[in-house]
Amino acid sequence: KSSNEATNITPKHNMKAFLDELKAENIKKFLYNFTQIPHLAGTEQNFQLAKQIQSQWKEFGLDSVELAHYDVLLSYPNKTHPNYISIINEDGNEIFNTSLFEPPPPGYENVSDIVPPFSAFSPQGMPEGDLVYVNYARTEDFFKLERDMKINCSGKIVIARYGKVFRGNKVKNAQLAGAKGVILYSDPADYFAPGVKSYPDGWNLPGGGVQRGNILNLNGAGDPLTPGYPANEYAYRRGIAEAVGLPSIPVHPIGYYDAQKLLEKMGGSAPPDSSWRGSLKVPYNVGPGFTGNFSTQKVKMHIHSTNEVTRIYNVIGTLRGAVEPDRYVILGGHRDSWVFGGIDPQSGAAVVHEIVRSFGTLKKEGWRPRRTILFASWDAEEFGLLGSTEWAEENSRLLQERGVAYINADSSIEGNYTLRVDCTPLMYSLVHNLTKELKSPDEGFEGKSLYESWTKKSPSPEFSGMPRISKLGSGNDFEVFFQRLGIASGRARYTKNWETNKFSGYPLYHSVYETYELVEKFYDPMFKYHLTVAQVRGGMVFELANSIVLPFDCRDYAVVLRKYADKIYSISMKHPQEMKTYSVSFDSLFSAVKNFTEIASKFSERLQDFDKSNPIVLRMMNDQLMFLERAFIDPLGLPDRPFYRHVIYAPSSHNKYAGESFPGIYDALFDIESKVDPSKAWGEVKRQIYVAAFTVQAAAETLSEVA
């Protein structure tokens, strides 16, 4: 049988049938259903939702739907001993206390089990001391404090505004600076867009709203107690002292009403420049400590949260492939939320649900995909990508041999302006071609393609007439698949206009106000953006699972490898004298990139010409495409980050959310001028160039003719 016969109807018709079956009204209905109560990881409510999804996916027609459970380390506030921060006077009396909970949104006043704002995995403690304002607590902010302003954070409690980088990096930086506690707050400059009302009258953050979130530095480890292996029934667990990535100092988040009370008293140094000023009516002085009359007052933290090994549940659905059942295309997104999850994650989970329903409908009509499609509803993403990582650890041998692609499906929207895509270069052409076939939902682009509106609103900085596609970083469930296992990955969602909205993420992120009504009233009343995201995610899965030749273009990898090599070379060339002194050369890397480019070009020519009716040759060519991403994996991992194994991309060491190219070289060069042993530091740069050059060359050779 040819592959088309095996899947009954022609591929073009299949795709249209699949896309036509996706309905905005269903996504809306599913979102409502998923957001009526909290679904915090490790709770009974989230277990019940897992069973509901399992049941519905079975009804939709999947071949099998199983729950995969793990016992992982989670973190919860103490119900009887709440967390808070106080200002204390010289007698130790608490003269101000931060709020213990967010005022509930209208209609939700009687909902139980709303977890109060907390920083997951904070240790317990009651530190007291002077406050230092550290801006966003980025690496460069601490450099400015320590090196320019001569401010020592040792023994201080630092207050940092959310935004710009992952909160776990902020805490790590504060720890390294010697702080004894961290207060995180949402500044209106970052979480209150001008001209928009606060919730419930608009989509802005009210003063009592607070962002929850984990503060781990796992670097891809998954469950902190079982790094590298699944947290199953017979797991060996590390002691808490040896757990991966746990913070060592108390941390707590607050809203801007409470932050105002702390920041308005700050003394010490003026802020170094306007980039350190937010929008509160306070001087943004850095400290240390309070000013003048308030100088004897201190800040005290009261943190009583506990870490507990708790059972979590992934839902794994399978739609068996008709021709290549041992090749897996995975669509996964998480199900657990901090509270109601109106955007994160349920706007994504509702889209996955509708994609499953559409695939199920086709299957009931006798169709099957060429390759197996796996659908996943991950648990405990908010606690460090735990569900996805444990499942991938349990199934790593299968995944590294059979994994074709992973498409992530967290929040479908973070705005309603245009599409945002982050993916492997292998998927660039797939995304371009797909979006050219989809209708734009944007006002003013009626009858135009999604590609056209996306390109107009978010143009590529390098190539005119093309849209921006970003590097994959982390902070979501694709991490283990891409950064550890080397499975081609991508993600898509609708986003804000980054030009006019400079706030970080969306204002109500991880707050109690992230409700169904937030989406239905303010972001996407017609659910047209959700539908578009369903079409993009679903369409990518469809093509990856059903196209005869995998829709990967290795030539696009060649282009970005040259760009990344140029970029890292220019960073290194900021130190021309040292490069000369230590004989640092990038020739091997540029040579490997040139070889990759030539071999990729030849491979692409062969791909056009080979006999697609020969199943052995077809499988061979597809395997070369599938394994190309895998070829960029270094089994030894990056220095001090063994689970980040991709040599071309890794989450930035300074911001987990951002992707860094040639991360090994980048980290070796970072702040190299301050290293105590320059010879050793430049030796590491040379070693990392060697690793990168070897890896690119080795990857190129996987595309050569096999004999």
């Epitope: 302003m149 003394g267 010490g268 003026a270 170094p272 420049d273 980039s275 000013t291 001028e673």
Partner: antibody, heavy 116, light 107 residues
């Protein structure tokens, strides 16, 4: 080796503008703010403003009421101070100084003479 | 703007003398005060920051103290190379402001 090297002395007529440059080397230019401080003959030091080279954003001393403009050229690792509508009392030595709030590193200074 | 007023405007002392220069802020600046030394024809050099912390390489005979509005720079044993003008600077509020300077000479 760390250095801030400023452009040479200037003589300007009242009402004209002057642009002084400050070439930085030996450190990561975008990591540190650049300040401009002037000193009229026999007078105190006077802070004019600062620029964050990473973002190109500047903060000014309001005393100069829009007469001063601070810019940077990242690729040339150079900071610039332009002062317009010059008057005789602007005759001073103009310094660039690296730092935030504190000035541990200074350029050698540029004498600007305003005379008709 | 915060005014910084130094006293005396000038002083003359002998080698080995203990010399004290004071600086008064027009409003409280906590300890956000720095002291600079400027030798004739040279650029200013940072001596003290955070009112009392000596900058790298500054001789131990230089010390600073104070908080709020009153600050002092002390040279415990005056040396010939200390002939210079000394400036205080506040960095608690923008605009950053300097004192008018104290010119120190050797008798």
């Amino acid at each position: 080796e760390f250095q801030l090297v400023q452009s040479g002395a200037e003589v300007k007529k009242p009402g004209a503008s002057v642009k002084v440059s400050c070439k930085a080397s030996g450190y990561s230019f975008t990591d540190h703010n650049m300040n401009w401080v002037r000193q009229a003959p026999g007078q105190r030091l006077e802070w004019m403003g600062l620029i964050n080279p990473n973002y190109g954003t500047a903060d000014y001393n309001q005393k100069f009421k829009g007469r001063v403009t601070l810019t940077v050229d990242q690729s040339a690792t150079t900071a610039y101070m332009e002062l317009s509508s010059l008057r005789s009392e602007d005759t001073a030595v103009y310094y660039c100084a690296r730092g935030s709030s504190l000035f541990a590193y200074w350029g050698q200074g540029t004498l600007v003479t305003v005379s008709s | 703007d915060i005014q910084m007023t130094q006293s005396p405007s000038s002083l003359s002392a002998s080698v080995g003398d203990r010399v004290t220069i004071t600086c008064k802020a027009s409003q409280g600046v906590d300890t956000a005060v720095a002291w600079y030394q400027q030798k004739p024809g040279k650029v200013p050099k940072l001596l003290i920051y955070w009112a009392s912390t000596r900058h790298t390489g500054v001789p131990s005979r230089f010390s600073g103290s104070g908080s709020g509005t009153d600050f002092t720079l002390t040279i415990s044993s005056l040396q010939p190379e200390d002939v210079a003008t000394y400036y205080c600077q506040q960095y608690s509020r923008y605009p950053l402001t300097f004192g008018q300077g104290t010119k120190l000479e050797i008798k």
